[in-house]
């Protein structure tokens, strides 16, 4: 879902699933600003103190990152200015499942949206001809 209205910006997320041991993406988009320096992205996970990831002033700020995500997260930095706040999660673990919040702040206002991230041992079905 997204929040919109006065002093709020629309943020959109999509429920997604991650394959254990592989890399996953938590999708989040917002109406982009034209410039980069006003954009702050924070990813949070329900039940976890500290941040999953933070991007501000054009670069990552991992000073408040929770240790369970250390070295495993990245945003698509070159795409932030076009409204992509999606999070890349490396080496997905079973414990990564849960409710995440994508929080965005720009010069116009702020907004957030939640997504449910499912993890498991998913595989493509084999097709025999």
């Amino acid at each position: 879902f997204g929040i919109s209205g006065k002093h709020f910006i629309t943020v959109t997320t999509f429920t997604s699933a991650g394959n254990i041991g592989e890399d996953g993406t938590l999708s989040c988009t917002f109406e982009p600003d034209i410039k980069l320096n006003g954009i702050v992205i924070q990813w949070l996970k329900e039940g976890i103190k500290g941040l999953v990831h933070e991007f501000k002033e054009g670069k990552d700020d991992l000073s408040q990152q929770h240790e369970m995500f250390r070295g495993r997260t990245a945003v698509f930095a070159d795409q932030v200015v076009v409204g992509n706040a999606s999070l890349r999660l490396k080496n997905v673990q079973l414990t990564d499942a849960g409710t995440y919040t994508c929080y965005i702040r720009t010069s116009k206002g702020k907004g957030n949206a939640n997504l449910e991230y499912k993890t498991g041992a998913f595989s493509m079905p084999e097709i025999n001809v």
Partner: antibody
Framework: EVQLLESGGGLVQPGGSLRLSCAAS????????MHWVRQAPGKGLEWVAS????????YYADSVKGRFTISRDNSKNTLYLQMNSLRAEDTAVYYC?????????WGQGTTVTVSS | DIQMTQSPSSLSASVGDRVTITCRAS??????VAWYQQKPGKAPKLLIY???IRESGVPSRFSGSGSGTDFTLTISSLQPEDFATYYC?????????FGQGTKLEIK
């Protein structure tokens, strides 16, 4: 093919007005911010104004603030620049450009000449 | 406002030469820098964005590097079609600003 096509330039007297248009095709116009950039004869590039995809963010260069207005009509895939109180120093080729990480698509430009 | 200072303002080189153009921002712009090529009478063309990412369709002889305040555009082996004017631009903050340009001429 992704294309931007400017129109509306011409010769105008100081103090006059012009409205530039930029018709977009070949991409989802409503998903992109847009810019106007100008280039005076023999000079470098100068950013003029920008507008985000849904018009939520609008910015102007100090040199045109209060005189120029950027707008867009997503239903018509068109970007506009309303230019009032034109001055000799506004004489330039005006380009529209698509906002990405940088300006990834440019129109061919339309020439504005301000002279008496 | 952030000033983008390009150097040199003009440069003479020969086909096959390696050429480097630098751009210095008056304050940190992270990696929010783009490079453009412009030929006479034509619109600029995006070469590099996010300081180092080559735009689709741009030849691999063009490369960008840098972050913070110092940025470089390198052409590894000049081709005849590369003689043009090159501009850097920051999109970190408004007003968006361009360098003054570097005119690359045939020696």
């Amino acid at each position: 093919e992704v294309q931007l096509l400017e129109s509306g330039g011409g010769l105008v007297q100081p103090g006059g007005s012009l409205r530039l248009s930029c018709a977009a095709s070949g991409f989802t116009f409503s998903s992109y911010g847009m810019h106007w950039v100008r280039q005076a004869p023999g000079k470098g590039l100068e950013w003029v104004a920008s507008i985000s995809s849904s018009s939520g963010y609008i910015y102007y260069a100090d040199s045109v603030k209060g005189r120029f207005t950027i707008s867009r009509d997503n239903s018509k895939n068109t970007l506009y620049l309303q230019m009032n109180s034109l001055r000799a120093e506004d004489t330039a080729v005006y380009y529209c450009a698509r906002a990405s990480s940088g300006m990834d698509v440019w129109g061919q430009g339309t020439t504005v000449t301000v002279s008496s | 406002d952030i000033q983008m200072t390009q150097s040199p303002s003009s440069l003479s080189a020969s086909v096959g030469d390696r050429v480097t153009i630098t751009c210095r921002a008056s304050q940190s712009v992270s990696s929010a820098v783009a490079w453009y090529q412009q030929k006479p009478g034509k619109a600029p063309k995006l070469l590099i964005y996010a300081a180092s990412i080559r735009e689709s369709g741009v030849p691999s002889r063009f490369s960008g590097s840098g972050s913070g305040t110092d940025f470089t555009l390198t052409i590894s082996s000049l081709q005849p079609e590369d003689f043009a004017t090159y501009y850097c631009q920051q999109y970190y903050s408004t007003p968006l600003t361009f360098g003054q340009g570097t005119k690359l001429e045939i020696k």
